[in-house]
């Protein structure tokens, strides 16, 4: 079970919206807060440890997940080609 604690949006840049989200999750042993289908969720802790973010299935159904080369996050590509980038901090 997860709840969004904070959600900040910055739309000051043209054609680009930056959102910062923090979630609080109550997870079972061996799990940790992550993202599944673009929502906060409890995921296998090994996914976070190894930065294999796409294994969380973080993108919406129909979107393609792509790891950032430096492992700092992932992108979700919509069928129309629009790319949403998520970085983990």
């Amino acid at each position: 079970t997860c709840e969004i604690v904070t959600l900040d949006r910055d739309s000051s840049q043209p054609r680009r919206t930056i959102a910062r989200q923090t979630a609080r999750c109550a997870c079972r042993k061996g799990q940790i807060a992550g993202t599944t289908r673009a929502r906060p969720a409890c995921v296998d802790a090994r996914i976070i440890k190894t930065k294999q973010w796409c294994d969380m299935l973080p993108c919406l159904e129909g979107e393609g997940c792509d790891l950032l080369i430096n492992r700092s996050g992932w992108t979700c590509t919509q069928p129309g080609g629009r790319i949403k980038t998520t970085t983990v901090s």
């Epitope: 294999q52 393609g64 792509d66 790891l67 430096n70 492992r71 992108t75 590509t77």
Partner: antibody
Framework: AVTLDESGGGLQTPGGALRLSCKAS????????MGWVRQAPGKGLEWVSA????????SYGSAVKGRATISRDNGQSTLYLQMNSLRAEDTAVYFC???????????????WGHGTEVIVSS | ALTQPSSVSANPGETARITCSGG??????YGWYQQKPSSAPLTVIY???ERPSDIPSRFSGSSSGSTHTLTISGVQAEDEAVYFC??????????????FGAGTTLTVL
């Protein structure tokens, strides 16, 4: 079968530029991260660059950072490496590499091209 | 950088082991690449222990702590080659970047 066919090498002059190509076949090119690895004469393997599936994210080894640009054309199943301000130490065989399981690291390459030789000399 | 022995030798039919250590613990394991003179590298093991379908089962990979090992059981003459291990290095400047060992020459006696 997976094949990676590089081209674009040859004799180059210091300070010049080149563009290497890697034509891929035998797999869904757009589903895999790709990279370039080079090997100087008589030396070991050196990581050059990598690119994610969509082409939106890239990384470069320290020896080529600021002089190289990796790109891809998923429609043409082709990977590119543009190298500027060439130096003698860029002389090497350049290999195209395919990542396994949709991501690429030096631990996850599952296919290599035959290589294209680049010689930088005046 | 990754550390591997410069040379290893074995008689035909024996077991050869090549070790590799160092790199970043990125969770993506180690790869092992075979290269014969004037040829491109060939992947024999990737992600620690996965073997491409066209690679004989005598090639296997394993990890114990910070040491990673390529094992060739029942070495054959055609296994004579240079073997490179591959992993990641991490820098705050570039993030994770691929890195390879200097190579180990396997000689079949």
């Amino acid at each position: 079968a997976v094949t990676l066919d590089e081209s674009g090498g040859g004799l180059q002059t210091p300070g010049g530029a080149l563009r290497l190509s890697c034509k891929a076949s035998g797999f869904t090119f757009s589903s895999y991260q790709m990279g370039w690895v080079r090997q100087a004469p008589g030396k070991g393997l050196e990581w050059v660059s990598a690119i994610n599936k969509s082409g939106s994210d890239t990384s470069y080894g320290s020896a080529v950072k600021g002089r190289a640009t990796i790109s891809r054309d998923n429609g043409q199943s082709t990977l590119y490496l543009q190298m500027n301000s060439l130096r003698a130490e860029d002389t090497a065989v350049y290999f195209c590499a395919k990542g396994s399981a949709s991501y690429i690291t030096a631990a996850t390459i599952d296919a290599w091209g035959h290589g294209t030789e680049v010689i930088v000399s005046s | 950088a990754l550390t591997q022995p410069s040379s290893v030798s074995a008689n035909p039919g024996e077991t050869a082991r090549i070790t590799c250590s160092g790199g970043a613990s990125s969770g993506y394991g180690y790869g092992w690449y075979q290269q014969k003179p004037s040829s491109a590298p060939l992947t024999v093991i990737y992600k620690d222990s996965e073997r491409p379908s066209d690679i004989p089962s005598r090639f296997s990979g394993s990890s114990s702590g910070s040491t990673h090992t390529l094992t060739i059981s029942g070495v054959q003459a055609e296994d004579e080659a240079v073997y490179f291990c591959g992993n990641d290095d991490y820098s705050s400047d570039s993030g994770y970047v691929g890195v390879f060992g200097a190579g180990t020459t396997l000689t079949v006696l």
